[in-house]
Every structure is written in C-alpha cells, then in structure tokens.
C-alpha cells in the first residue's frame, strides 16, 4: 500500500517517499522505484537553507553600496548574504534592504545608546544636573560644572541645554 506520510528528510511524490535534498543542494530529479533522488550543489552566488525539493536555488542578497549597504557576512551555499550599513548609517528594517543616516540628539538630549549598522541612535533627556548644548550622534549628557570645587559660586544656573556659569565669591566688606 502506498504511503500517506513520509519520515523526516523525505517528501511524498507519485505515491512514493523520496529523500529531500540537503541544504545547499537543489533537486535535479525525483526518486523512482529504482533510483534515488538526485540533487546538485547551488551555484557560486546561490543558496538553499533548508532540506528541500526546490529545483532552483535562491540568489544571494546583493548589498548595494548605492543604498549605503556593505557585506557583513558573505553567503554560502546554505546561507544568505547578510548586509549591514556603512559608517554613520543604519538599516531601515530587519532585512536591511536600505540605510538612513543616524539620528543626532538635539541640545537638551544626550546619547543613551550609540547607533550601530542595524540600530538608530537612542537619545535621552538630560536630567537635572546634566546638559547637552550640541546636536550630536555621539555625545552623552555632561554634568554641570561644580563651581564649589573651583572655589567659585554659581552666577547663572544651568539648564538641560546649558552649563552653570561660575563666578568669584563676593568678598564681605569689613
């Protein structure tokens, strides 16, 4: 009686269980009663990443430099190429099909996490006691200057965008 289900690494065709091709190889011909499944390796710029019965391999992804992309990991016959973005850019999606420039943190905000090829800059508001007076993709919030340690006094309070202004202490008249 012909099988209705096949074991792992097999597929059902013409009432018969045939062996699947291993990752990295494509189907050339199905098995018969007398012959095994025939498979051949994918070409130089192709891959198949699963046990399969595909008659064509998939093309490796192209990391287009015009879109700011570069190769992070070269593809093999079993894996696709992995793209990442050039310096100063990050991917717009998980599949990394194009890149955009990293966001800068505006004055009053500092960099919480520097951007990578796959993630954008994460900014955070400068808390009390810290400031950022520049628009930057790298700079963290900096602490206000401590006037006391310089034997000075605060002449102008700091904000999240400006440092405190220190000045000399008023000498008390005799």
């Amino acid at each position: 009686e012909p099988p209705t289900a096949c074991r792992e690494k097999q597929y059902l065709i013409n009432s018969q269980c045939c062996s699947l091709c291993q990752p990295g190889q494509k189907l050339v011909s199905d098995c018969t009663e007398f012959t095994e499944t025939e498979c051949l390796p994918c070409g130089e710029s192709e891959f198949l990443d699963t046990w399969n019965r595909e008659t064509r391999c998939h093309q490796h992804k192209y990391c287009d430099p015009n879109l700011g992309l570069r190769v992070q990991q070269k593809g093999t016959s079993e894996t696709d190429t992995i793209c990442t973005c050039e310096e100063g850019l990050h991917c717009t999606s998980e599949s990394c099909e194009s890149c955009v420039p990293h966001r800068s943190c505006l004055p009053g905000f500092g960099v919480k996490q520097i951007a990578t090829g796959v993630s954008d800059t994460i900014c955070e508001p400068c808390p009390v006691g810290f400031f950022s007076n520049v628009s930057s993709a790298f700079e963290k919030c900096r602490p206000w200057t401590s006037c006391e340690t310089k034997d000075l006094v605060v002449q102008q309070a700091g904000t999240n965008k400006t440092d405190v202004v220190c000045g000399p202490q008023d000498r008390q008249r005799a």
């Epitope: 062996s19 091709c21 050339v28 011909s29 095994e36 025939e38 498979c39 051949l40």
Partner: antibody
C-alpha cells in the same frame, strides 16, 4: 559484474603531466555521475573531482583547481583526469568511482582498483 | 574549509557492538556516507544517506546522523569487519572525507 579499471599512472617529475583513464564496463556509463578520489601512501581518502553524466557540471578540490581537468567520453565508456603541474604532494593512488545518485543523496558505490602516481625528481 | 573529524582508532571484541563517530559543524544538515577499506583493497560503500545500506551490505551495519555527530554502528562485530572506516559528506561544491578510523577486532 560492474567494473572500473584505471590506467595511466606512473613516475613523473615535478611540474610534469599525466593523463589517467578509467574504463567502465557492465553498466550504462552515461547514466552515472563519476568522481576521482586519491589516497597518499599510508594516508586517508581525498576527493579530487566530480563530473555529471553529460559532463556539463564539474567540481574540483581546491588543492587541484587550475591544474587538473576531469572529462568523460560516454561513447567510449571512459573517464579521464588530465593532471598538469604535478607536485610531490600529488603522489597517491588515484581511484575512479561511480556515484549511485547525483549529489549528496548518493554515495560512491563502485570503485576501481586504483593507479599509482608518483611525483619525484 | 569544512572538516569531518573521526577518532583514529576504535577497538571491539568479537560479537560486541562497535561505534565509530564522525563529527562536523552542522553535520545533521548533511547526508553522510560511510566507506570500509581493508588493507590493499579499494574502499566499499557501506552506508549512504545517513542510514541506507547498499545491496550486499550486511544488516549489522547501521548509521545515524543528528546535530554535529554521525555514527556508524556495527553490531555483532566479526573479525572480517577489521578495516579502516571513512565518513564522507558534501559541503558546498566539494566532497569531504573524514580522516578515517582504524577498527581493530580484538582476540
């Protein structure tokens, strides 16, 4: 019974050339993918090259790429290995073998007796 | 380049079960063949596609493959099974052999 017989081995100087032949009998040669495998004295098996039924798909080991050429003549039931630029490390017994199916689903189910190639000055 | 690693030698008493391993990265993602080679002879295919036996190969030869290890098992080992055993797989567009394991049947 199914038979593969290699010939053409011998002593050759480094940089020299040799052409190995493998004569197939008692099976339909054109139905099978074929390989050359070698074994250095006292060492393990090393795959050399692979050719499809029609000869349109060919693979080589990195160690012989650009120096060795595999070919076949289905009308003569013969497999060949042209070896140029021979080096001392090519010294080995060379086997031709039949693959029971294309690619990884197969296995080399019939081997010749081997022919010895010695590269020495 | 891809490598298959085998123990250089395995010993077994007659009638016992011999297990020869072959390990490699993502090996379970490949089909494995096993060859037997006796001194002065050409190799003989004993297992292909992980577990299939060509005609004429005794039932005491069996194979399995999972994860990073493939195993050739010879149950009820006989003196005539003493030989070198090689695993083999395809990787990309090349065929790769393991370094071989010498099986010694004691006694």
């Amino acid at each position: 019974q199914v038979q593969l017989v290699e010939s053409g081995g011998g002593l050759v100087k480094p940089g020299g050339s040799l052409r190995l032949s493998c004569a197939a009998s008692e099976f339909t040669f054109s139905d099978y993918y074929m390989s050359w495998i070698r074994q250095a004295p006292g060492k393990g098996l090393e795959w050399v090259s692979y050719i499809s039924r029609s000869g349109d798909t060919i693979y080589y080991a990195d160690s012989v790429k650009g120096r060795f050429t595999i070919s076949r003549d289905n009308a003569k039931n013969s497999l060949y290995l042209q070896m140029n630029g021979l080096r001392a490390e090519d010294t080995a017994v060379y086997y031709c073998a039949r693959d029971l199916a294309a690619g990884a689903t197969g296995g080399l189910d019939c081997w010749g007796q081997g022919t010895l190639v010695t590269v020495s000055s | 380049s891809y490598e298959l690693t085998q123990p250089p030698s395995v010993s077994v008493s007659p009638g016992q079960t011999a297990s020869i391993t072959c390990s490699g990265e993502r090996l379970g993602n490949k089909y494995i063949c096993w060859y037997q080679q006796k001194p002065g002879q050409s190799p003989v295919l004993v297992i292909y596609q992980d577990f299939k036996r060509p005609s004429g190969i005794p039932e005491r030869f069996s194979g399995s493959n999972s994860g990073i290890t493939a195993t050739l098992t010879i149950s009820g080992t006989q003196a005539m099974d003493e030989a070198d055993y090689y695993c083999q797989a395809w990787d990309s567009r090349t065929v790769v052999f393991g370094g071989g394991t010498k099986l010694t049947v004691l006694g």
